[in-house]
Interface confidence: medium
């Protein structure tokens, strides 16, 4: 019935966060017995997501208050039988619109979950959850759809012209014709021999009775054929039997007069001359998390929800699993990002779903001509002259080392270095002394620094 | 010295929960996952899930259908698989192991904890 | 899931003779088979990993060879203190899944 800020709880915040206009969705979920939360987050009864949704526009500085929630129905159709105890989750979605919202578009407000205890075909049940800072007002009530019936909706009644010993009204199941459907609790008031009702809060009559409560008979009535009431005198006290009279709209439908007849106004969800038939289509809005519905303009042709990645369901309701498929290879663990999946590797494994083992030389090649050496489980690259790195992609400073010897000095060249020697010396590393008397020149103690090896850098 | 040690012998009813725990010593807790396997009697080892310590990632074997969930608390240095709706046919020694995360699998297990289910 | 069909069941051997355990997968796992041992009262041991590299602190007696399907466990020179029940797990995706066990015995 409200959304809004809680009592007492500090500043009220408004559920547009005055971030201009905005929308709230309610997303119901059913879920079985106690809800278990960290293991099981399908709602396995079923879910459903609020479609009557009007715009709030707030202005800045205007005091937050509770925001009035529409009339429309959130309509949860439940597979198989009622199982009278569930767990009962409602998620507030805000979606801010306009141009400069800001921030994400949508929002996860509120949750609130809850055990519950209820039995098809009782009274609305109200009640207000409090979660954070904000407090939900709702009622929730469980109903079968005809023709099953009881309170777990698990026994099929279909109307029968054979007389059963089922009191007026109540009509005999089948196939246990000695069980008769239990009772709604009709309007106060509603004749018990005359009227019944399919829905709590409705009284509809029998044939040959009318009137609000079904207390009128119609066949005695003096004013069978006027369409207004006559002077006091003839007892005519109610209109007379129109098309609308008796209410022939099932399901909560309101009947209006069109030439001589009646058309139903049903609400969401009911469909039929009379909103006898209960059936979804796309107006709906059956499709949760960004499903596409395709098809159901009618509720003879079945609408079908395209689901985006991420979530599968008749209504796209329940997040698929995709870790479970186990993409990730050599042990990588998954995360399901729900826009994509990614692999967290195992170390010494890469790649999207980490299959390239980068211990393993047939994995990875090395780089700038290097070679791969593979030993004691585990790969390594012995890269060519001027390059270096794991995989041989740096170039590599060859006068880092400093090779050239007695105060040589060093030049790096694209085929790897040259020295300049020092006067009195000469060599690829300037490793010889020259004699001054021309003899052979002969290999001189090093000066300071070892003389370095002329190797390839690794 | 790396030490993975079990909680103690568990008897429980079907239907009923079962939290195991499994305390690391003698390495940095967080570096290294942490896998769950069982041995059912006269069975094959069959691997359960593993769970990254340092933000509790966790993959499962789908077999086990949600019923186990695997949890971390790094404060205590201990691991913990909790099976829910035990059947008989759960009836297991249930291990913890240790993975290296580099290339060897699990290279350190528990002692293992015994879980009998049984009406 | 990768089945791994473990052969033989049982295998008894001489003391310092060589034992010999096979491993099959159904599907080619690359190199990415690990063994272990398996002793009652002391905790399971990894023996050799990725197929054939040796775990630290495991006797050199032991060795892995194999890849893509078909992969062995040689013990070289059986010892006393190798009685044991020997496992092979394929650890190149998950779930990870392990053979049936050879039991190893003293002839």
């Known amino acids: 019935h409200s959304f809004g800020p809680g009592p007492g709880l500090g500043t009220p915040r408004s559920p547009c966060n005055a971030r201009g206009p905005c929308r709230l969705f309610f997303r119901v979920c059913l879920k079985p017995g106690v809800s278990q939360e960290a293991t099981e987050s399908l709602c396995a009864l079923g879910a459903a997501l609020s479609t009557s949704v009007p715009v709030y526009t707030e202005h800045p500085g205007e005091s937050a208050a509770a925001l009035p929630l529409p009339d429309g129905l959130v309509r949860v159709p439940f597979r198989d039988a009622w199982p009278g105890t569930f767990s009962l989750v409602i998620e507030t979605w805000r979606e801010q619109l306009g141009e400069h919202a800001g921030g994400p578009a949508w929002n996860l407000l509120a949750r609130v979950v809850g055990r519950r205890r209820l039995a098809a075909g009782g009274p609305w049940a109200r009640d207000v959850q409090r979660t954070g800072t904000w407090e939900l007002h709702f009622s929730y009530r469980a109903r079968c759809e005809p023709p099953a019936v009881g309170a777990a909706c698990a026994r099929l009644c279909r109307s029968r012209s054979a007389p059963s010993r089922c009191g007026p009204g109540l009509r005999p199941c089948t196939p246990f014709p000695d069980e008769c459907e239990a009772p709604s609790v009709c309007r106060p008031g509603c004749s018990p021999e005359h009227g019944y009702c399919e829905e709590p809060d409705e009284c509809r009559c029998l044939e040959g009775w009318t009137g609000p409560l079904c207390t009128v008979p119609v066949s005695t009535s003096s004013c069978l054929n006027s369409r207004v009431p006559g002077p006091a005198s003839t007892g005519c006290l109610l209109p007379g039997p129109g098309p609308c009279d008796g209410n022939p709209c099932a399901n909560g439908g309101s009947c209006s007069e069109t030439s001589g007849s009646f058309e139903c106004a049903c609400p969401r969800g009911f469909y039929g001359l009379r909103c006898e038939v209960s059936g979804v289509t796309c107006a709906d809005g059956p499709c949760f998390n960004g499903g596409l519905c395709v098809g159901g303009e009618d509720p003879d042709s079945a609408y079908v929800c395209h689901c985006p990645p991420g979530f599968q369901g008749s209504n796209c309701e329940k997040r698929v699993d995709r870790c479970s498929l186990q993409p990730c290879q050599n042990g990588g663990l998954c995360l399901d990002l729900g826009h994509a999946l990614r692999c967290r590797c195992r170390a010494g494994f890469a790649g999207p779903r980490c299959e390239h083992d980068l211990d393993d030389c047939a994995g990875r090649a090395c780089a700038n001509g290097g070679t791969c050496v593979e030993g004691g489980g585990s790969r390594r690259c012995s890269c060519a002259l001027g390059f270096g790195g794991r995989d041989c992609r740096e170039r590599a400073d060859p006068c880092a080392s400093r090779p050239c010897a007695h105060g040589g000095r060093c030049y790096a060249h694209f085929s790897g270095l040259v020295c300049a020697c020092a006067p009195g010396y000469m060599g690829v590393r300037c490793e010889f002394a020259v004699r001054p008397d021309g003899a052979d020149a002969v290999p001189a103690a090093p000066r300071g620094l070892r003389q370095a090896d002329p190797q390839r850098f690794l | 010295e790396v030490q993975l040690v079990q909680s103690g012998a568990e008897v429980k009813k079907p239907g009923a929960s079962v939290k195991v725990s499994c305390k690391a010593s003698?390495?940095?807790?967080?570096?290294?996952?942490m896998h769950w396997v069982r041995q059912a009697p006269g069975q094959r080892l069959e691997w359960m899930g593993v769970?990254?310590?340092?933000?509790?990632?966790?993959n499962y074997n789908q077999e086990f259908k949600g019923r186990v969930t695997l949890t971390v608390d790094t404060s205590a240095s201990t691991a913990y698989m909790e099976l829910s709706s035990l059947r008989s046919e759960d009836t297991a020694v249930y291990y913890c192991?240790?993975?290296?995360?580099?290339?060897?699998?699990?290279?350190?297990w528990g002692q293992g904890t015994t879980v009998t289910v049984s009406s | 899931d990768i089945v791994m069909t473990q052969s033989p069941d049982s295998l008894a051997v001489s003391l310092g003779e060589r034992a010999t355990i096979n491993c099959r997968a159904t599907?080619?796992?690359?190199?990415?088979l690990a063994w272990y041992q398996q002793k009652p009262g002391q905790t399971n041991k990894l023996l050799i990993f990725?197929?054939?590299t040796l775990q630290s602190g495991v006797p050199d007696r032991f060795s892995g060879s194999g890849s893509g399907t078909d992969f062995t466990l040689t013990i070289s020179s059986l010892q006393a203190e190798d009685v044991a029940v020997y496992y092979c797990?394929?650890?190149?995706?998950?779930?990870?899944?392990f053979g049936g066990g050879t039991k190893v015995e003293i002839k």
């Open positions: 003698g390495y940095t807790f967080t570096s290294y996952w």
């Open positions: 990725s197929g054939s």
């Open positions: 769970i990254d310590p340092s933000d509790s990632l966790a």
């Open positions: 599907k080619s796992i690359s190199k990415y």
């Open positions: 192991a240790r993975d290296s995360t580099v290339v060897a699998p699990m290279d350190y």
């Open positions: 797990q394929q650890h190149h995706e998950y779930p990870y899944t």
